[in-house]
């Protein structure tokens, strides 16, 4: 009988660690952000790109904020971050303004304590996009692991945003907490 | 549609400088190279060269460096064209044009006749 | 720069035949797998107006009549069946390399 009542009380400390830890997991922080295809600025100048998606598609976002174009930490910890950004053309749209583009991203890391901002990733390449192909396209893709406080933020800087590939599976960024500071 | 008025005529002096205007409409201005070509009277097309709207990018031919000067205005989305030190040799229709969403140059000005007479 | 000679300078085509213009490049005007030259019509006080562009695609409105061929130097604008409102000057063109250029023109008068 004891043994019964021993088991029986494992199983029930066993749901509650399962609980726990689900609930524990349901806490953990991630975001993973799409580009918004409305609000990309113009031009070939290196810019901030403040305008993501959070809740439709794939994007999704949980325990952590956007705002103002920035992904902010609400839970200290060490977070892996990641950003892939994809450039096109194809000649119906227009015409290059030139034929040697610098194309890149820089993943940045702000503090508002103290306030600083720092680089956290950079991918990219010098391109020749010959005005004479009918089709361009160019992939970069950055992750990295990274220790992160409460209340800094993430944002994302291109060069060439007008020619950015508007699609969700093509331009985002997100980030998901691996495990607490010690 | 793709639209683009030119200037009206110019009669100016041997010496003297012309400003001719492309005003564009029915497209983003920024977005696409405008060209100029000069066409004297009875005589073939000559490119001179050609506008990048947005940053103000500009290309050449060789003959026409040191003659035309091309700016754009892009919030009034008019590309211009100055010619300078005018001889009789000026003398001709100038076009605007832009290519279409393939290649080839699908859209033209209406064209503007300057004439260089003492 | 690429130079585009055109012949015949001018042409005398009677109403229902055929015409044929040429248009030879100084040096190759291919590349990416495409031809970068286009034909023109211009008649007399108007601008001219694009007919065939990259070679052999005809562009939007333009009468069936009216086809190119040809790759790397060597052009052909044919007019199947010439009727009366095809008299006018044809020119070649080649947005392949800066400076873009034009060929000479050539006259076509209908009998």
């Known amino acids: 009988g004891s043994q019964h009542i021993r088991a029986e009380k494992a199983m029930v400390d066993g749901s509650w660690l399962d609980l726990a830890k689900r609930s524990k997991l349901e806490a953990q922080p991630f975001a993973h952000l799409t580009i918004n295809a409305t609000d990309i600025p113009s031009g070939s100048h290196k810019v901030s790109l403040s305008s993501w998606y959070h809740d439709r598609g794939w994007a999704k976002i949980s325990n952590m904020t956007f705002s103002n174009g920035k992904l902010i930490v609400n839970q200290d910890g060490f977070y892996y971050l990641y950003a892939n950004i994809c450039f096109r053309h194809h000649e119906t749209s227009g015409d290059l303004a030139t034929e040697y583009l610098q194309l890149m991203v820089y993943v940045t890391k702000t503090s508002i304590k103290i306030p600083s901002s720092h680089t956290l990733m950079k991918g990219g390449s010098t391109k020749y996009w010959s005005g004479n192909s009918e089709f361009h396209f160019y992939s970069i893709n950055v992750g990295g692991f990274f220790k992160l406080r409460s209340g800094e933020e993430i944002s994302i800087e291109v060069s060439n945003p007008s020619l950015l590939d508007p699609d969700q599976d093509a331009t985002y960024f997100g980030a998901f907490k691996v495990r607490d500071i010690d | 549609q793709v639209q683009l008025q030119q200037s009206g005529a110019e009669l100016a002096s041997p010496g003297a400088s012309v400003k001719l205007s492309c005003k564009a409409s029915?497209?983003?201005?920024?977005?696409?190279?405008l060209q100029w070509v000069k066409q004297r009277p009875g005589q073939g097309l000559e490119w001179i060269g050609a506008?990048?709207?947005?940053?103000?990018?500009?290309k050449y031919t060789q003959k026409f460096k040191d003659k035309a000067t091309l700016t754009a205005d892009k919030s009034a989305s008019t590309a211009y064209m100055q010619l300078n030190s005018l001889t009789s040799e000026d003398s001709a229709v100038y076009y605007c044009?832009?290519?279409?969403?393939?290649?080839?140059?699908?859209?033209w000005g209406q064209g503007t006749l300057v004439t260089v007479s003492a | 720069n690429i130079v585009l000679t055109q012949s015949p300078a001018s042409l005398s085509v009677s109403l229902g035949q055929r015409a044929t213009i040429s248009c030879r490049a100084s040096?190759?005007?291919?590349?990416?797998?495409?031809?970068?030259m286009h034909w023109y019509q211009q008649r007399p006080g108007q601008a001219p107006k694009l007919l065939i562009y990259?070679?052999?695609n005809l562009e939007s409105g333009v009468p069936a009549r009216f086809s190119g061929s040809g790759s790397r130097t060597d052009f052909t604008l044919t007019i199947s069946s010439v009727e009366a409102e095809d008299e006018a000057t044809y020119y070649c063109?080649?947005?392949?390399?800066?400076?873009?250029?034009f060929g000479g023109g050539t006259k076509l008068e209908i009998k």
């Open positions: 044009a832009r290519r279409g969403s393939r290649r080839g140059i699908a859209y």
């Open positions: 029915g497209y983003t201005f920024t977005t696409y190279w």
């Open positions: 506008i990048y709207p947005g940053p103000g990018n500009t």
């Open positions: 040096e190759s005007v291919d590349s990416y797998g495409r031809s970068f």
């Open positions: 990259l070679a052999s």
């Open positions: 063109q080649q947005d392949n390399e800066d400076p873009y250029t």
